[in-house]
């Protein structure tokens, strides 16, 4: 209802003499801030005075003064929402009702809180799950309805009076909803914990005992069993008798059924605590145990290993591994069922006893082809000697042996010949299934192990073959030693380095990259004419007439090879200059005359100079000198000079005659 003040706090708080009480509290006043607060002990309303009577434990007024006796009780709240209280220490006679008298400017309220103070520390309470089963983790809870900031406590767990090893988790609550201290312990009980006493002990900060709670554990578990056997070592010979007894040492709840198992399988019609085995056979060897069940489940005893002893049975040989690769290691294992285990072995290879081999295993570190064959063995123990079994076959595999590449052709081989090679070997296991050849080529294999090289190349130097089964064995390479005519013949200028100038000494070299056989002859030719038979062609002083197309030939006993034609070019100054005249050397005045400076030069003439009969240079620099109209005064001797980058050349004089025209003669 909106006319009420709203308070939140625990309904009742618990403590004991000498401890303390912390009262968490919140409130909301109807209007404004709190102006006055009185804490009463067991307040009663006086109708006459319209006030509350009772012991005043705490009082706060507008001036904020607090009497000195109020130090034990503290109001830790404020004027609008917090009403937390603390009583330290708390006494037995503090039990009862606490009344919080609150006054604001216009409203008043009395809030009641119950306080239960006992004479001595009250015990905590242990809470257990409804059922505890062995090896299933459970949480044990110890709860105490007390917590106070001014009075630290601790909760300790004990099993049969001894502190428990497991770590407990302690939590405290001091809220308006609840005040408590709680300890939780996670614990996996074993069947041996059944009936044991668990204690939760309340202690003060110094570990002094204050109170405790105890419970007895009821741990549900499968039956716990012990097995006994006669004879005690459980070792017998065929035909002996054996007795086994099953005893229950603990079961919760009580057991219901009994059975016996051999090698994990239930024995039929054996439902008593005693198992009698008469005239045992070797098949009865094995691991025995008894099984007893209750509502939790079946419990099993430890296993008893019953050994029925007998002489070795016929043996078999196991080979690790067959087929074996030559050079690898092989282990032979003699397998014979016997009890006790055989103490001595005899080994046979192809029916012949292997000397010095008496162990269960025979190890051959490096297998060779002669190790192949049948291996058998005989086992022996204290009860007798077994029989020799059928044995096992060792197959020793190895790469082809002594592989060779053989040339079938008559020697020598010439470039372009068809060469046939065969790949031979001595022995192989498994059989040779294929052959490989090096280097690879687009070659024919007309039959297995035969290689045919059509049109053999000059550079086919060596060939190797491999015979292959599971592995390939390579033969040493065989040299084909192919003979061929000289290759890559070319003309190379040795001197000069660059352009050949007229007068230079010139050396041309006839080069070739290879020849087989090595012995060669050289031939030089120009325009089909033989010039020399040395590797070099030398010109002491070259002239323009030596220019032209040169070739060299290199031959050996297989054939001859020509170089590409090599053009020899000679640079020279202009020569053979002459002045030609058109239309002729006699021209009528008034007509036109053209003088041309003809020359032979390399590089071509780039600059011409014309001179007259007085050796006066004329202002013309092209190859043609054109006189138009020609005059009689032009008559005379002319010469020209040609210049290229090498030098100059001059022509002899050429005379031009200009005669008068009929008109001129007529005028005279």
């Amino acid at each position: 209802d909106s006319s009420k003040w709203v308070f939140e706090h625990p309904e009742t708080l618990y403590a004991w003499e000498g401890a303390c009480v912390w009262i968490p509290c919140t409130y909301r006043a109807l209007d404004g801030d709190l102006e006055s607060f009185i804490l009463f002990h067991n307040p009663e309303y006086n109708k006459n005075t319209s006030k509350f009577d009772g012991t005043r434990l705490y009082e706060s007024t507008k001036d904020g003064k607090v009497p000195s006796e109020q130090k034990r009780v503290q109001f830790l709240g404020d004027k609008n929402k917090n009403c937390t209280l603390s009583i330290h220490p708390v006494h037995l006679n503090d039990s009862g009702q606490l009344g919080l008298r609150m006054e604001s400017k216009t409203e008043k309220w009395m809030e009641r809180i119950h306080l239960n103070v006992s004479e001595r520390p009250f015990p905590p309470h242990i809470q257990l799950p409804p059922e505890i089963q062995e090896s299933q983790e459970v949480t044990l809870t110890c709860l105490l309805n007390f917590s106070c900031y001014g009075y630290p406590i601790q909760l300790q767990w004990l099993l049969e009076g001894v502190p428990m090893r497991q770590a407990a988790v302690t939590s405290t609550s001091l809220t308006i909803k609840s005040v408590f201290t709680r300890s939780e312990l996670k614990f996996s009980p074993q069947w041996s914990h059944h009936g044991k006493i668990v204690t939760c002990q309340l202690q003060d900060a110094d570990g002094k005992f204050l109170s405790n709670d105890t419970v007895q554990l009821n741990v549900k578990h499968t039956p716990k069993l012990e097995i006994k056997v006669t004879p005690s070592d459980a070792i017998v010979r065929e035909g002996d008798s054996v007795t086994m007894t099953c005893e229950v040492s603990s079961s919760n709840p009580e057991y219901t059924t009994v059975s016996w198992l051999k090698d994990g399988t239930s024995l039929k019609k054996q439902n008593t605590f005693t198992l009698n085995l008469r005239e045992v056979t070797k098949d009865q060897s094995g691991k025995y145990c008894c099984q007893v069940s209750n509502d939790v489940g079946p419990g099993r005893s430890e296993e008893v290993f019953l050994q029925v002893q007998y002489a070795p049975e016929p043996s078999t040989v196991q080979i690790l591994h067959s087929p074996a690769v030559e050079g690898s290691q092989v282990e032979f294992l003699c397998m014979s069922l016997a009890n006790p285990l055989p103490t001595n072995y005899t080994w046979y290879h192809n029916g012949k006893e292997m000397q010095g081999r008496t162990e269960e295993k025979v190890h051959i570190p490096k297998i060779l082809p002669w190790h192949a064959g049948t291996y058998s063995c005989v086992a022996e123990n204290i009860l007798g000697t077994g029989q020799r079994g059928p044995g096992a076959e060792l197959d020793v595999q190895y790469p082809p042996k002594k592989v060779t590449t053989v040339i079938q052709n008559p020697m020598p081989i010439r470039e372009g010949d068809t060469v046939t090679l065969s790949c031979n070997y001595n022995s192989s296991n498994p059989s040779v299934t294929r052959y490989e050849w090096k280097p690879h080529g687009a070659w024919e294999e007309p039959s297995l192990g035969v290689l045919k090289i059509q049109n053999v190349g000059w550079d086919n130097t060596t060939i190797a073959c491999a015979a292959c089964n599971s592995w390939c064995s390579w033969a040493s390479p065989v040299a084909l030693n192919v003979q061929y005519a000289p290759r890559d013949v070319r003309v190379r200028k040795i001197k000069p380095l660059s352009e050949i100038h007229s007068g230079n000494s010139v050396s041309l070299q006839c080069d070739f990259s290879s020849s087989h056989p090595k012995e060669v002859q050289f031939f030089w030719e120009k325009n089909g004419r033989l010039l020399g038979k040395e590797s070099q062609l030398n010109f002491d002083s070259i002239s323009p007439e030596d220019a032209g197309s040169y070739s060299c030939w290199v031959n050996n006993s297989i054939g001859q090879t020509a170089s590409k034609a090599w053009t020899l070019e000679v640079l020279y100054a202009p020569r053979r200059l002459r002045v030609s005249m058109s239309p002729g050397d006699q021209v009528m005045e008034g007509k036109s005359a053209t003088l041309t400076c003809e020359s032979d030069a390399n590089p071509p003439v780039s600059h011409y100079t014309w001179f007259d009969w007085n050796n006066q240079s004329l202002p013309y620099h092209s190859q043609k000198l054109r006189l138009e109209p020609v005059k009689v005064q032009h008559s005379g001797a002319y010469w020209c000079q040609g210049t290229n980058s090498v030098g100059k050349g001059r022509s002899p004089l050429s005379t031009l005659t200009v005669y008068y025209s009929p008109e001129t003669i007529g005028r005279r």
Epitope: L497, E499, N504, S505, S541, A573, P603, S606, N644
Partner: antibody, heavy 113, light 107 residues
Framework: QVQLKESGPGLVAPSQSLSITCTVS????????VSWVRQPPGKGLEWLGV???????NYHSALISRLSISKDNSKSQVFLKLNSLHTDDTATYYC???????WGQGTTLIVSS | DIKMTQSPSSMNASLGERVTITCKAS??????LSWFQQKPGKSPKILIY???RLIDGVPSRFSGSGSGQDYSLTISSLEYEDMGIYYC?????????FGAGTKLELK
């Protein structure tokens, strides 16, 4: 192998004449031309002239009035003479076979008073 | 005189890079052109003559091409020892003239 070596005065006063000798080994001057090329400091190459195996010469037109090239085949020597020197004739002077097949290491000329 | 215009005047290149230097003649020189390499403090060395003919002993990464007025020198894959100044020389027309040079440096 072919080797060329220039020898010159190093320092010459302006208006004076320059004479440089190029000594050739490894080939005959009867058969080969010798060119002269110069290179001013930090600049490019300039062709000056050539004397051929037969003794004929060819000079750069810009220097024709100041330059003369001669040789002594028996001593395998070629001579360059440059008259009326100016400061811009300062350069390294090289001799070379034909038009640069083989070069001498050069001789440095400084024209300064 | 024939003027030989060489370009670029200088260039920086990385090892392994392809490098091309060009020379342009002011008139047709008929492939009468050679290329020279000069290293600092050394005399020039001939590499190529007649525009495209490689001198014996010069590495094959050097090649020359061109005709008429336009010519070029190419280094297919630059090596450290190729640093220096490169000159072209025309000898087709008197007087012989060199290009101004191309300085090749490592980037």
């Amino acid at each position: 192998q072919v080797q060329l070596k220039e020898s010159g005065p190093g320092l010459v006063a302006p208006s004076q004449s320059l004479s440089i000798t190029c000594t050739v080994s490894g080939l005959s001057l009867n058969n080969y031309g010798v060119s002269w090329v110069r290179q001013p400091p930090g600049k490019g190459l300039e062709w000056l002239g050539v004397i051929w195996g037969d003794g004929s010469t060819n000079y750069h037109s810009a220097l024709i009035s100041r330059l003369s090239i001669s040789k002594d085949n028996s001593k395998s020597q070629v001579f360059l003479k440059l008259n009326s020197l100016h400061t811009d004739d300062t350069a390294t002077y090289y001799c070379a076979i034909n038009w640069g097949d083989y070069w001498g290491q050069g001789t440095t000329l400084i024209v300064s008073s | 005189d024939i003027k030989m215009t060489q370009s670029p005047s200088s260039m920086n290149a990385s090892l392994g890079e392809r490098v091309t230097i060009t020379c342009k003649a002011s008139q047709d020189i008929n492939s009468y052109l050679s290329w020279f390499q000069q290293k600092p403090g050394k005399s020039p060395k001939i590499l190529i003559y007649r525009a495209n003919r490689l001198i014996d002993g010069v590495p094959s990464r050097f090649s020359g091409s061109g005709s008429g007025q336009d010519y070029s020198l190419t280094i297919s894959s630059l090596e450290y020892e190729d640093m220096g100044i490169y000159y072209c020389l025309q000898y087709g027309v008197f007087p012989l003239t060199f290009g101004a040079g191309t300085k090749l440096e490592l980037k």
